[in-house]
């Protein structure tokens, strides 16, 4: 059986500190990531470089209990958060309707076996709507790196220009209209945004347990897959083997 | 098969407190809400709240916070419920519930009670 | 915190005989709701959960429904084992909340 996994997680993912010390994993987050009032945003947490089983994933949002996704049972969404949390994709969360006390700390608590707990934190800064389309002091590393390599672009272009002005205008318009695509390109892929059709993991093996409706569903694009998610209903928790 | 052993009756002083079990058999005890209802002749049932041992997360009903206390011993299966400065006004008998999610696993099985008489 | 009203509060009814009783939220609970019974030694069992699913182990007789806010519980046919006390319980938010409860008695 095919088992879907959409996974938000990117080059912009970061390492986040293991709880405890012998063990090999390591936990990669969306680290610090910002979003618009009264939009969405999906938190997502990716466990590798370890062999353990995932049991469960627990999310908190500072020390209040968001949702739990387990191996055997699938999700329990906190009923304080019922009518803001959807699961998923996979084992991520989805917090909808943001206000700006939404801002804050958030954990993904991995419960594995034999190794033990993993913990990645993910820090979300809910924005006023003019600042989120407006500002860029606080935006994701995969935003940040894009930056840097438009100022790199940039500089070559100036440089290009003084050494050739004659051909300036052609250039830079060709230059700015090509960055336009990439930045639009890049943005489908940040971690805050859905993964581009057809971006499906499969499962190495269905969990024993679940008891969700999800089961026969094909791979789906995101907003297909909120659709048919009832999402306080024991949706599946696509537990597979997250190795790096 | 699910079970849920409660302890058994209690008969105890005003002011003094209780302290009463829930052990959990058939199922993996970590995986499920473990919830708290008191019942009162004339006063129906009352949810007290709940805990989860796979996390230790509990929620309280605001009417029971600072009279009930919720815990749970993974390695024994049992949870335990905690009352305080007893009055006749918690004179009941109170049930554990096992819970988890919205549909198949909500609130499904039940112990049998454990009997609370506060008299002096 | 949520109010659930049940009715009737109590209720006599013969062997065989058709019987509904029902439950009105105060506010929305999206079918989140349980019906419960209480034989007279105390033992509760869940009938019914997510406003019409049966129960494991519940016999086919009973049924659940709803109709915007209010919630039925519905037994197609009473059997002599039927006749205890029955609850509704809104799980949707926290506080949990129940019926006062109806006593169904052998008329």
């Known amino acids: 059986m095919r088992w879907c996994l959409l996974l938000i997680w990117a080059q912009g993912l970061r390492q986040a500190p293991l709880a405890s010390g012998m063990m090999t994993g390591t936990i990669e987050t969306t680290g610090n990531i910002s979003a618009e009032k009264g939009g969405s945003i999906i938190l997502q947490c990716h466990l590798s470089s370890t062999t353990a089983q995932v049991t469960q994933v627990n999310w908190e949002q500072q020390d209040q209990l968001l949702a739990i996704c387990n191996a055997d049972l699938g999700w329990h969404i906190s009923p304080s958060f019922k009518d803001r949390v959807a699961p998923g994709p996979g084992l991520g969360l989805t917090l909808q309707s943001l206000t700006v006390n939404d801002t804050g700390e958030y954990f993904c608590i991995y419960h594995t076996y034999p190794d033990g707990t993993y913990t990645g934190r993910i820090f979300l800064e809910v924005l006023e709507s003019s600042v989120a389309e407006h500002g860029a002091r606080f935006q994701i590393p995969l935003l940040g790196a894009m930056a840097a390599t438009l100022v790199v672009i940039c500089t070559a272009v100036i440089v290009v220009v003084a050494l050739t002005r004659k051909k300036k205008a052609l250039r830079i318009h060709s230059v700015e209209g090509d960055l336009r695509r990439k930045s639009a390109g890049q943005e489908e892929w940040s971690p805050s945004a859905p993964s581009p059709p057809g971006s499906c993991v499969q499962a190495e093996a269905a969990p024993a347990g679940l008891c969700g409706e999800q089961r026969g569903e094909d791979c789906a694009e995101l907003h297909d897959y909120f659709n048919v998610l009832s999402y306080r209903s024991l949706g599946n928790c696509s537990f597979f083997t997250e190795t790096g | 098969q699910v079970q849920l052993q409660q302890s058994g009756a209690e008969l105890v002083r005003p002011g003094t407190s209780v302290k009463m079990s829930c052990k959990a058999a058939?199922?993996?005890?970590?995986?499920?809400?473990i919830g708290w209802v008191k019942q009162r002749p004339g006063h129906g049932l009352e949810w007290i709240g709940d805990i989860y041992p796979g996390g230790g997360y509990t929620n309280y009903n605001e009417k029971f916070k600072g009279k009930a206390t919720l815990t749970a011993d993974t390695s024994s299966s049992t949870a335990y419920m905690y009352l305080s400065s007893l009055t006749s006004e918690d004179s009941a008998i109170y049930y554990c519930?096992?819970?988890?999610?919205?549909?198949?696993?909500?609130?499904?099985?039940w112990g049998q009670g454990t009997s609370v008489t506060v008299s002096s | 915190d949520i109010q659930m009203t049940q009715s009737p509060s109590s209720l006599s009814a013969s062997l065989g005989e058709r019987v509904s009783l029902t439950c009105r939220a105060s506010?929305?609970?999206?079918?989140?709701l349980s019906w419960l019974q209480q034989k007279p030694d105390g033992t509760i069992k869940r009938l019914i959960y997510a406003a019409s699913t049966l129960g494991s182990g519940v016999p086919k007789r009973f049924s659940g429904s709803r109709s915007g806010s209010d919630y039925s519980l519905t037994i197609s046919s009473l059997e002599s084992e039927d006749f205890a006390d029955y609850y509704c319980?809104?799980?949707?938010?926290?506080?949990?909340?129940f019926g006062a409860g109806t006593k169904l008695e052998l008329k």
């Open positions: 058939g199922y993996t005890f970590t995986n499920h809400w």
């Open positions: 319980l809104q799980y949707d938010s926290y506080p949990f909340t």
């Open positions: 519930a096992r819970s988890y999610g919205y549909d198949l696993y909500a609130m499904d099985y």
């Open positions: 506010q929305e609970i999206s079918g989140y």
